[in-house]
């Protein structure tokens, strides 16, 4: 595989990661699908200081980031350890909540408007930001 | 000048198999996704596949899940679609066509076109 | 799956004719949506993404509106070499992008 060393046009770059800020809203599920698309993923928040850098792009916008627990437990996207990890929920986030009216609870993490994280129904159409690592070598499968 | 040139396709049996391919050239290849979308005689347009630019992340629709799939080689600038168990709806003009505008997700060059005929 | 519906499925028009074309999607889309011109025997052309942003090179006479659920591409002034199938195509479910079934633009 090849390894990626500069980020994709309309990409930041960001202590040895790129990230790209989208525009308009998706569902978390088709946010995740772009991302992938683009060899990325939906980020990883792994540090205050990431979060700070994320939380400035976007401004004060619901948007979706790589934490979900659609299958049970909180899992990062990347499998980054949810347990032992940075955390930034809001106050007596996430709630599961259900009275939104819209079948289920809430399984999708997203920022707030100031940035701290909630839960909410996967389907709702937020922004997202996709995040790859620079210096990571590519998935392309070995030539046959 | 950008360009996409499909081959590969013709006259095939139900259950049969064929491999279409696609030459890219004028781009970076591998800085795109790329889609197959096929068109039934007389019919409208269906998207059939895409892959990532690395390869790494490929997806279907629905009615070629668990028949097709689609691989790149980026050293060669070339997309593929290998097709398997072969039905008579499968039956179109098959084009490749590069996600060039990703944030719209817009297919924004097209190949010519193969022609596969799934017939006994 | 989403599901895209064009309108009219066919049109007649003569030259210099102000022509719209209408697309309505099943569920809102924000802005996701594409238009393309397909003539016969040719592959298809993206003329308008992102609902309203002009593809290069593309003519100014094409334009695009609309969001969430319903879309409109309008020729200003149609030409000779506008007689074509235009297709609508949802971008926002990623990646199961439908198309609408096309509308033909038939010589009056």
């Known amino acids: 595989g090849s390894e990626r060393t500069c980020c994709p046009v309309n990409w930041v770059e960001h202590e040895r990661s790129c990230y790209w800020f989208s525009r308009s809203g998706k569902a978390w599920a088709d946010a995740d699908n772009y991302c992938r698309l683009e060899d990325a993923h939906l980020v990883v928040v792994t540090s205050w200081e990431e979060q700070k850098f994320v939380q400035h792009h976007i401004g004060p916008v619901n948007t979706w980031m790589g934490l979900h627990d659609q299958n049970g437990p909180w899992k990062w996207v990347d499998g980054t350890d949810y347990e032992t990890g940075f955390k930034n929920w809001r106050p007596e986030q996430p709630d599961d909540w259900y009275g939104h009216g819209l079948g289920g609870g809430e399984d999708c993490a997203h920022f707030t408007d100031d940035g701290r994280w909630n839960d909410d129904v996967c389907q709702r159409p937020y922004r997202w930001v996709c995040e790859t690592e620079l210096d990571k070598a590519s998935q392309e499968p070995p030539l046959l | 000048e950008v360009q996409l040139l499909e081959s590969g396709g013709g006259l095939v049996q139900p259950g049969g198999s064929l491999r279409l391919s696609c030459a890219a050239s004028g781009f970076t290849f591998r800085s795109y996704a790329m889609s197959w979308v096929r068109q039934a005689p007389g019919k409208g347009l269906e998207w059939v596949s895409v892959?990532?630019?690395?390869?790494?992340?490929?997806y279907f629709a629905d009615s070629v899940k668990g028949r097709f799939t689609i691989s790149r080689d980026n050293s060669k600038n070339t997309l593929y679609l290998q097709m398997d168990s072969l039905r008579a709806e499968d039956t179109a003009v098959y084009y490749c066509?590069?996600?060039?505008?990703?944030?719209?997700?817009?297919?924004?060059?097209w190949g010519q076109g193969t022609m596969v005929t799934v017939s006994s | 799956d989403i599901q895209m519906t064009q309108s009219p499925s066919s049109l007649s028009a003569s030259v210099g004719d102000r022509v719209t074309i209408t697309c309505r999607s099943s569920q809102s889309i924000n802005s996701y949506l594409n238009w393309y011109q397909q003539k016969p025997g040719k592959a298809p052309k993206l003329l308008i993404f992102a609902a309203s942003s002009l593809h290069s090179g593309v003519p100014s006479r094409f334009s695009g509106s609309g969001s969430g659920t319903d879309f409109t591409l309008t020729i200003s002034s149609l030409q000779p070499e506008d007689f074509a199938t235009y297709y609508c195509?949802?971008?926002?479910?990623?990646?199961?992008?439908?198309f609408g079934q096309g509308t033909k633009v038939e010589i009056n």
């Open positions: 066509a590069k996600r060039g505008i990703p944030e719209a997700d817009a297919f924004d060059i």
């Open positions: 892959i990532s630019g690395s390869g790494g992340n490929t």
């Open positions: 195509q949802q971008g926002y479910n990623t990646p199961t992008w439908t």
